[in-house]
């Protein structure tokens, strides 16, 4: 039961995280104009990964896409790539994890297969979360170090006198959405990996084999022989019959051909 809950919760947390990563990637407010110590606030610039916007204080807003690829900073391209990789990995992870969920039965899929799929999706979520966190952090670092600040010129006065003002940019809402979403995806992935350990059979059990005793018509059915060092006792008080131990989470299996004479 605990395994199912952990797996389900991991799936939901990852789902929310990936939705957040997608939202952050699409948002325009990755960097916003720092209005501190800037009294003439006629326009407010804010920029995303895909387009730049300007909001004029009387109410007009306009956005423009970055139509060039070659003219953009390499770091911006890297951030785009990281976010897209994160989304793709997360989406594949979600698809895999849906089939891995214990509460969903697909044909006669064994627990070992579900465990492997849970682990795979967990790893995908972890990498997806790390990609998002890395992308957002790289962008934040760019802002902090003024890596791709655009200089806005404010032309004032007569006779061509020019006053150049450096437009400073600060963290936009998308950065915080990205960090939280990446963290959630990472946590969800860890939970899936933990759930995988509970799904996988802990011990290898040999199937019981029925023997015909010579001279007797009685069939003997020994209990499941554990693969162990010989000193191990049944510490977990698991029932040992019908061909070996089963965990609580294990689905009921059909009798094997060896179970009866």
């Amino acid at each position: 039961m605990a395994v199912t809950a952990c797996q389900g919760l991991g799936f939901v947390v990852s789902l929310i995280g990936i939705a957040g990563i997608i939202a952050a990637t699409c948002m325009d407010q990755w960097s916003t104009q720092d209005l501190y110590n800037n009294p003439v606030t006629a326009v407010f610039n804010y920029q995303g990964l895909w387009r730049s916007c300007v909001r004029e204080s009387s109410g007009f807003t306009e956005c423009r896409g970055y139509f060039t690829l070659l003219g953009l900073p390499a770091m911006l391209q890297a951030v785009r790539a990281l976010m897209i990789v994160g989304i793709v990995l997360g989406a594949i992870g979600l698809l895999v994890s849906i089939f891995a969920l214990k509460c969903i039965r697909i044909g006669s899929m064994e627990d070992s297969a579900k465990a492997n799929m849970t682990l795979t999706s967990g790893i995908m979520f972890i990498v997806s979360g790390l990609c998002a966190i890395a992308g957002v952090s790289v962008f934040a670092n760019m802002l902090v170090t003024n890596f791709w600040m655009s200089t806005a010129n404010m032309y004032t006065g007569m006779g061509g006198m020019v006053q150049t003002v450096q437009t400073r940019y600060t963290f936009g809402a998308a950065l915080f959405v990205g960090w939280v979403a990446g963290g959630l995806t990472l946590i969800g992935g860890v939970m899936m990996c933990i759930a995988c350990r509970g799904l996988a059979p802990e011990e290898t059990n040999y199937k019981a084999v029925s023997y015909h005793a010579s001279g007797h018509s009685v069939a003997y059915k020994p209990g499941g022989f554990k693969a162990s060092t010989g000193f191990g006792s049944n510490t977990k008080n698991k029932k040992i019959y019908d061909g070996g131990a089963r965990t609580e989470d294990e689905v009921q299996s059909y009798p094997s051909k060896h179970d009866y004479v």
């Epitope: 610039n45 007009f60 306009e62 806005a152 404010m154 032309y155 437009t167």
Partner: nanobody, 126 residues
């Protein structure tokens, strides 16, 4: 580089009219998106705080400040890159330094920028 040249300010009696004009020059390397007028009342000169009066975009959409609606009319000529502000029924509280402004996207720039004129004084006496 874009320069804005204003004209039309002056002294007028309350209830009177004035027309402010503004022409943009050197805009061949930039796309002017919004043009309009801001003002800076005498009390705000020190902290450089300017308030929007009226703005118009390239499609002809217009925004007016609530305080001037119904009294001021803005018009723009996109071909000539000029903007005019017809001010009617002027009140003493309209006294301010009026700035022409343009919001433009320089060619190849990632973000927009604002260009200001030098300002023209409008004084409304009671």
């Amino acid at each position: 580089q874009v320069k804005l040249e204003e004209s039309g300010g002056g002294l007028v009696q309350a209830g009177g009219s004035l027309r402010l004009s503004c022409a943009a020059s050197g805009s061949s390397n930039a796309d002017i998106r919004f043009m309009g007028w801001y003002r800076q009342p005498a009390g705000n000169q020190r902290n450089n705080q300017r308030e929007p009066v009226a703005m118009v975009d390239t499609t002809g959409r217009i925004n007016y400040a609530d305080s001037v609606k119904g009294r001021f009319t803005i018009s723009r000529d996109n071909a000539k890159n000029t903007v005019s502000l017809q001010m009617n029924s002027l009140k003493p509280e309209d006294t301010a330094l009026y700035y022409c402004t343009a919001v433009l996207w320089p060619r190849g720039a990632i973000s927009a920028m604002t260009v200001w004129g030098q300002g023209t004084q409008v004084t409304v006496s009671s």
